[in-house]
């Protein structure tokens, strides 16, 4: 009081940091720094992040909040979690779609687009692995279907249909006409 030397940062608690002249308590997540504290070990003036902005961490220096990301509709993305004052929008894919990363070394922040999951049923195949982080993994042909080329072909409904060896093995036709 009355002196001129700025105080050392020896405030109680560990959330004080020098901002300008003084050691200040920072702003909690979801708040931005409007003005630094005006006395040693004081509280900074912090305001809540406006709508559509956020700050995820406690901070001493952010004088504005980050703008919430918009999910990329052209990449078929949807908001899995809406933006809040403390967390950004979490974008992902709607049910029945999976994330296809746009870069080879894929991390959570990598750009991505959403691809429709393979419908194994429509391909007359068993679903071996459900689609979530990657595409559906389809298995063998469903009962009543047999492998033919890349697809599954329906077993013939009568003995008049042609039934090659694989067909006969799967469909149960023993006699060939």
């Amino acid at each position: 009081q009355g002196g001129t030397r700025s105080p050392r940062c020896d405030c109680a608690g560990d959330f004080h940091k020098k901002i300008g002249l003084f050691c200040c308590r920072g702003c909690p997540a979801g708040h931005y720094l409007k003005a630094p504290c005006t006395e040693p070990c004081g509280n900074s003036t912090c305001l809540v992040c406006p709508q559509d902005t956020f700050l995820a961490w406690e901070n001493h220096h952010n004088s504005e909040c980050a703008r919430c990301q918009a999910c990329d509709e052209q990449a078929s993305q949807v908001a899995l979690e809406n933006c809040s004052a403390v967390a950004d929008t979490r974008c992902g894919c709607k049910p029945g779609w999976f994330v296809e990363c746009q870069v080879s070394q894929c991390v959570s922040s990598s750009p991505f687009y959403c691809q429709p999951c393979l419908d194994c049923g429509a391909l007359h195949r068993h679903t071996r692995l459900l689609c979530s982080r990657r595409d559906t993994d389809c298995g063998t042909c469903l009962p009543g279907f047999y492998e033919h080329g890349d697809g599954c072909v329906s077993c013939p409904t009568s003995t008049l249909g042609s039934c090659p060896e694989r067909c006969a093995a799967v469909c149960g036709w023993r006699q060939m006409f």
Partner: antibody
Framework: EVQLVESGGGSVQPGGSLRLSCAAS????????MSWVRQAPGKGLEWISY????????YYADSVKGRFTISRDNAKNSLYLQMNSLRAEDTAVYYC?????????WGQGTPVTVSS | DIVMTQSPSSLSASVGDRVTITCQAS??????LSWYQQKPGKAPKLLIN???NLETGVPSRFSGSGSGTDFTFTISSLQPEDIATYYC?????????FGQGTRLEIK
């Protein structure tokens, strides 16, 4: 709109006293530290005093320590500078300024002349 | 006290010129440095805080850089309305101190 308006300047003889005022409007005065900065004729800027938002902490430049007193009345949105034992070298334009790290808002200044 | 040494003390430049002013602190002030513009008979106006943050409404031709002890203020393309005196100021440690100013004139 943020406004700071100084008043109380004038002419005084060496050894005399003056009380400067700074009326604040357009912002939450009680949330900000405030300072007085002066500028002698044809010279640069000189910080002379600072007061915390609550008024509990005050600081002074060596050139005015013991002669000048900074104070504030948050209820009246006003900042003051009581200047005693004035000297010729105190002749200057006196500005009040809002502290937000840097001095982001300044008044227009009030001139003080100390002369016999 | 921290001494702020500003240079040059005055300079003359033409409209459109790139203008640079430097400020040196006698000790480390991190990035707690601001730049002000003062026109004759007027109060100073804050242009830049925290060494490089442009104040809202200040034209983008003004910029600042530096940290520690050495700082630079630049006007990328001088305009007639930029004629003024420019001051640096540290707010790292009390007492707050200013550079002696740089008077900028048009050639």
């Amino acid at each position: 709109e943020v406004q700071l308006v100084e008043s109380g300047g004038g002419s005084v003889q060496p050894g005399g006293s003056l009380r400067l005022s700074c009326a604040a409007s357009g912002f939450t005065f009680s949330s900000y530290g405030m300072s007085w900065v002066r500028q002698a004729p044809g010279k640069g800027l000189e910080w002379i005093s600072y007061i915390s938002s609550s008024g509990g902490h005050t600081y002074y430049a060596d050139s005015v320590k013991g002669r000048f007193t900074i104070s504030r009345d948050n209820a009246k949105n006003s900042l003051y500078l009581q200047m005693n034992s004035l000297r010729a070298e105190d002749t200057a334009v006196y500005y009040c300024a809002r502290y937000s790290g840097a001095f982001d808002r300044w008044g227009q200044g009030t001139p003080v002349t100390v002369s016999s | 006290d921290i001494v702020m040494t500003q240079s040059p003390s005055s300079l003359s430049a033409s409209v459109g010129d790139r203008v640079t002013i430097t400020c040196q602190a006698s000790q480390d002030i991190t990035n707690y440095l601001s730049w002000y513009q003062q026109k004759p008979g007027k109060a100073p106006k804050l242009l830049i805080n925290d060494a490089s943050n442009l104040e809202t409404g200040v034209p983008s031709r003004f910029s600042g850089s530096g940290s520690g002890t050495d700082f630079t203020f630049t006007i990328s393309s001088l305009q007639p309305e930029d004629i003024a005196t420019y001051y640096c100021q540290q707010y790292d440690t009390l007492p707050i101190t200013f550079g002696q100013g740089t008077r900028l004139e048009i050639k």
